[in-house]
């Protein structure tokens, strides 16, 4: 594969580990066919931004986890009243235990019914999934090359839909096997549409496959 690395990739590295191609390399090929564009952001700045994005993502995840904990607490507080034992004696506590046992039995029955429904749904989902696999079985899935994840992709993975609102998330290009015909690719789905649509793509496939 031709070396189309950016400034960040050219900077000296402490260990001569095999270079994993960045998605930005491929993006450069796709968007600027005839001229390599110098990165406007230095490697240290990129790292700083990536760290910042990770921190934001971490905070967001922590906040979501806290929200879930709070929601669980609220749900439990509505279902489980405080025991309020002050002033109650042995007789009332006996009766309270009976009441709570009756409540537990009722909840257990409900849980059993829900579990039965869930099991039924899981079975149905498994059956449908199997049917999908059976239908897709005749098509060979292309093997995808691993690329170093970009800050954009990392944010999308961590924040999901929210990242799209604030960041320019670009599609990752994927490696294609020589033997995959156009017909098969069309049948498999839209995964290559964006790449094939780009100008001069056919002429540079060899670079991806080297």
């Amino acid at each position: 594969m031709a070396d189309g690395s950016s400034d960040a990739a050219r900077e000296p590295r402490p260990a001569p580990a095999p270079i994993r191609r960045r998605s930005s390399n491929y993006r450069a090929y796709a968007t600027e066919p005839h001229a390599k564009k110098k990165s406007k952001i230095s490697a240290s700045r990129k790292l700083q931004l990536k760290t910042l994005l990770l921190q934001i993502a971490k905070q967001e995840l922590e906040r979501e986890a806290e929200e879930r904990r709070g929601e669980k607490g609220r749900a439990l507080s509505t279902r489980c009243q405080p025991l309020e034992l002050a002033g109650l004696g042995f007789a009332e506590l006996q009766d309270l235990c009976r009441q709570l046992h009756a409540r537990v039995d009722k909840v257990d029955e409900e849980r059993y019914d829900i579990e039965a429904k869930v099991t039924k749904n899981i079975t149905e989902i498994a059956d449908l999934t199997q049917k999908i696999f059976d239908l897709r079985g005749k098509f060979k899935r292309p093997t995808l090359r691993r690329v170093r994840i970009s800050a954009d992709a990392m944010m999308q993975a961590l924040l999901g839909a929210r990242a799209k609102e604030s960041l320019d998330l670009r599609a990752h290009l994927k490696q294609v096997k020589k033997e995959d015909t156009e017909k098969e690719n069309r049948e498999v789905g839209d995964w290559r549409k964006n790449i094939d649509a780009l100008s001069g793509m056919e002429g540079r496939k060899k670079k991806f496959e080297s």
Partner: antibody, heavy 121, light 107 residues
Framework: EVQMVESGGGLLKPGGSLKLSCAAS????????MSWVRQTPEKRLEWVAT????????YYPDSVKGRFTISRDNAKNTLYLQMLSLRSEDTAMYYC??????????????WGQGSSVTVSS | DIQMTQTSSSLSASLGDRVTISCRAS??????LNWYQQKPDGTIKLLIY???RLHSGVSSRFSGSGSGTDYSLTISNLEQEDIATYFC????????TFDTGTKLELK
């Protein structure tokens, strides 16, 4: 000084309904379970209802279950007894009492003066 | 329901006497027994809880004892202000139940 004052009693016909109130003072009301106890014309004492300190749990004897409802308003330091489908055997002096406990033993440590309820056709 | 019974519905005694009022439960109530005093004007007061514990502000002339199904309240050196009706109440099992009461009178 711990004090309980009942009100709302009266004379009514069988099948009627009535709501008794008990205003408590002299202690932290929300920390205590409360009870209603009645005394029949024959001078027998009968436990009628108990409610936990926060109002989540209530207890009744079979004789009033489904007809009587004990409730409380901790903000107003007031205990209530809603009585429906009253019968002649519900005729009694109704006392409001504070509950306390000691190693599982519960008791009514302070009582009000009582409110008279008469059910007669 | 646990039935509570007193041996006598009324008792006559003289001032200064030692008076014992008995109470029996239809089954073991594991010391969950309380004693109350009702004055002629209708006011009710707790005297003894958990068989033998004296409630605050109650004269030490009052004492309680017993276990299992048999319990008693003792008034040593009877005074005029002790003339009242005495009730025992079990707190072992719901419904909470009282006895019919023992009316204490002067001879």
């Amino acid at each position: 000084e711990v004090q309980m004052v009942e009100s709302g009693g009266g004379l009514l016909k069988p099948g009627g309904s009535l709501k008794l109130s008990c205003a408590a003072s002299g202690f932290t009301y929300s920390n205590y379970a409360m009870s209603w106890v009645r005394q029949t014309p024959e001078k027998r004492l009968e436990w009628v209802a108990t409610i936990s300190s926060g109002g989540s749990y209530s207890y009744y004897p079979d004789s009033v279950k489904g007809r009587f409802t004990i409730s409380r308003d901790n903000a107003k330091n007031t205990l209530y007894l809603q009585m429906l489908s009253l019968r002649s055997e519900d005729t009694a002096m109704y006392y409001c009492a504070r509950r306390d406990n000691y190693f599982g033993s519960s008791f009514m440590d302070y009582w009000g003066q009582g409110s008279s309820v008469t059910v007669s056709s | 329901d646990i039935q509570m019974t007193q041996t006598s519905s009324s008792l006559s005694a003289s001032l200064g006497d030692r008076v014992t009022i008995s109470c029996r439960a239809s089954q073991d109530i594991t010391n969950y027994l309380n004693w109350y005093q009702q004055k002629p004007d209708g006011t009710i007061k707790l005297l003894i809880y958990y068989t033998s514990r004296l409630h605050s502000g109650v004269s030490s002339r009052f004492s309680g004892s017993g276990s299992g199904t048999d319990y008693s309240l003792t008034i040593s050196n009877l005074e005029q202000e002790d003339i009242a009706t005495y009730f025992c109440q079990q707190g072992n099992t719901l419904p909470l139940t009282f006895d019919t009461g023992t009316k204490l009178e002067l001879k």
